[in-house]
């Protein structure tokens, strides 16, 4: 590869890129160094290749984009804008690229992109404006149709002071730029909590993954303005019961499948409620499947076999009547 | 020991051509940016240019944008400079430095400078 | 661009006293995850040479006399106890985007 590239956009808001000029035209759709092109399949992969920057002179065709595997580090503003822009990019695969800072306009410039994976990369510091690009209450809209942030969560010692669900949160929700998404993959990210607006301002959402996460209790969160919800993972959480409001919300989803497999289910008298929604309902994939974690005495009994008389609190004693 | 060393520097006029080289040793140049670095007689640094380690990337101050192209041979452990339609004010010692990548990166190691004199 | 502005211009320490260089940034050059400032010194008719990187780590070889501060737009670097080997002109430099940017420079003589 000639050391020519594609010219960068001169936005303002994407200075980063504003100095990768080619020194004499461009060679059209040249193949970068280290990567794999195919025209015919508009595909680039630049994979495993310890790449620290963005390539510059990727080829104009480029529809898929995989930079997977590499040390990028940081995505600075306007890291892919170029001059003419990656019109046609349509999906960027950034997975295990070892990235922990993606700033504000990293996406800007990329007209058609409608699918982002940014998987398995230790994300402490992911600006709010990463996906809208600014700073304004209410943004252009975003063209991303699938966010996949599986295994974005740094280790502990990383991360910063702050909720890192507050940070991935601000991201999804600034400038309500992600009101196109209808696909949002968040598994595997020690969340503990869902902040209760953010589902709320993703109405077009159709596949919600938050599996494998620490979610205790979906009691602050509401589904029902999530009309078009066809799939909400939950698996191998830390849920112990879901309550009428919950129930009641999900069952009015016309098109929903619920995952609710490897929870540590508390099968008491709190679980009344859910143990006949779960008889009655069709929303719940596998649900013979779900047993009891606690007590220690319905430890493994399978939730659609209990009855109420199964179901019992054991009584408060009052404080005079309570050992040690 | 890590050594950078500059070559290829001289008297130019303006609107004249030069190609400066830089050889590499004592680590494994594949797997290192490199920059040009430049100064003035009795001035500050200056950035140039940098190559990513698989020249996969490359990026020139405004001041030598379209004018200078930087390149690289792995194979041959060396950086290049060429240097197109040349100015004055380009007159400099140009220094090559290594770095571990463009933004989390920093010169850390140089070469001890060419120089390049742009004059009628 | 970032400009990057150092004060003062030249200083002149007496040997075995504190010498403290400022750097100013036009904007912010520190995310949470790294600091984007870097310190090098260059001695008369030698390249530059790197001390401190992300503001405040020494490079391997450097004298532990010298250390570096600072976030977001305002670093130093400081020299505990000035030595004669000290004297020459100190750069800081931002990484944060491009084009990277140097101070004017610092040029710091014995008193």
């Known amino acids: 590869s000639s050391p020519t590239s594609s010219a960068s956009s001169f936005s303002s808001s994407a200075p980063f890129l504003a100095s990768a000029v080619s020194a004499q035209p461009p060679l059209p759709d040249q193949c970068p160094a280290l990567c794999e092109c195919s025209e015919a399949a508009r595909t680039v992969k630049c994979v495993n290749r310890n790449l620290t920057e963005v390539p510059t002179d990727l080829p104009a065709y480029v529809r898929n984009l995989f930079l997977t595997g590499n040390q990028l580090a940081v995505l600075p503003a306007g890291a892919f804008a170029r001059r003419p822009p990656l019109a046609e990019l349509a999906a960027l695969n950034l997975s295990g690229s070892r990235l922990d800072e993606v700033r504000a306009g990293a996406f800007e410039h990329l007209p058609s992109l409608r699918q982002l994976d940014l998987s398995h990369n230790p994300l402490a510091d992911l600006s709010p404006f990463a996906f809208s690009g600014s700073n304004a209450s209410v943004s252009a809209p975003s063209p991303l149709v699938e966010l996949i942030l599986n295994h974005i969560v740094p280790p502990e010692d990383e991360r910063q002071n702050r909720s890192f669900e507050g940070m991935v949160v601000a991201a999804l929700l600034a400038g309500r730029a992600l009101q196109g998404l209808r696909r949002l993959e968040l598994a595997s990210n020690h969340f503990l909590y869902l902040p209760r607006d953010v589902l709320a301002q993703l109405p077009s959402l159709r596949h919600l993954d938050l599996s494998n996460n620490s979610l205790v209790s979906l009691t602050y969160v509401s589904f029902r303005n999530l009309t078009h919800l066809e799939s909400l993972h939950l698996e191998d959480n830390a849920l112990k019961v879901l309550h009428n409001g919950t129930l009641a919300e999900l069952q009015g989803l016309p098109h929903i499948r619920v995952f609710l497999d490897n929870n540590p289910w508390v099968c008491d008298c709190h679980m009344a409620d859910m143990v006949t929604w779960l008889k009655e309902t069709e929303v719940v994939q596998g649900k013979d499947r779900l047993t009891c974690a606690y007590p220690e005495k319905m430890r493994n009994r399978v939730l659609l076999e209990l009855n109420s008389a199964d179901l019992d609190c054991d009584p408060i004693l009052p404080p005079s009547l309570q050992t040690s | 020991e890590v050594q950078l060393v500059e070559s290829g520097g001289g008297l130019v006029q303006p609107g004249g051509s030069l190609r400066l080289s830089c050889a590499a040793s004592g680590f494994t140049f594949s797997n290192f940016g490199m920059h040009w670095v430049r100064q003035a007689p009795g001035k500050g640094l200056e950035w140039v240019s940098y190559i990513s380690s698989g020249s996969t990337s490359f990026y020139y101050a405004d001041t030598v944008k379209g004018r200078f192209t930087i390149s690289r041979d792995n194979a041959k452990n060396s950086l290049y400079l060429q240097m197109n339609s040349l100015r004055d004010e380009d007159t400099a010692v140009y220094y090559c430095?290594?770095?571990?990548?463009?933004?989390?990166?920093?010169?850390?190691?140089w070469g001890q400078g060419t120089t390049v004199t742009v004059s009628s | 661009d970032i400009v990057m502005t150092q004060s003062p211009d030249s200083l002149a320490v007496s040997l075995g006293e504190r010498a403290t260089i400022n750097c100013r940034a036009s904007q912010s050059v520190s995310s949470s995850s790294y600091t984007y400032l870097h310190w090098y010194q260059q001695k008369p008719g030698q390249p530059p040479k790197l001390l401190i990187y992300s503001a405040s780590n020494l490079e391997s070889g450097v004298p532990d006399r010298f250390s570096g501060s600072g976030s977001g737009t305002d670093f130093t670097l400081t020299i505990s106890s000035l030595q004669a080997e000290d004297v020459a002109v100190y750069y800081c430099q931002h990484s944060w985007e491009i084009p990277l940017t140097f101070g004017q420079g610092t040029k710091l003589e014995i008193k």
């Open positions: 430095s290594r770095t571990n990548s463009l933004l989390r990166g920093f010169f850390d190691a």
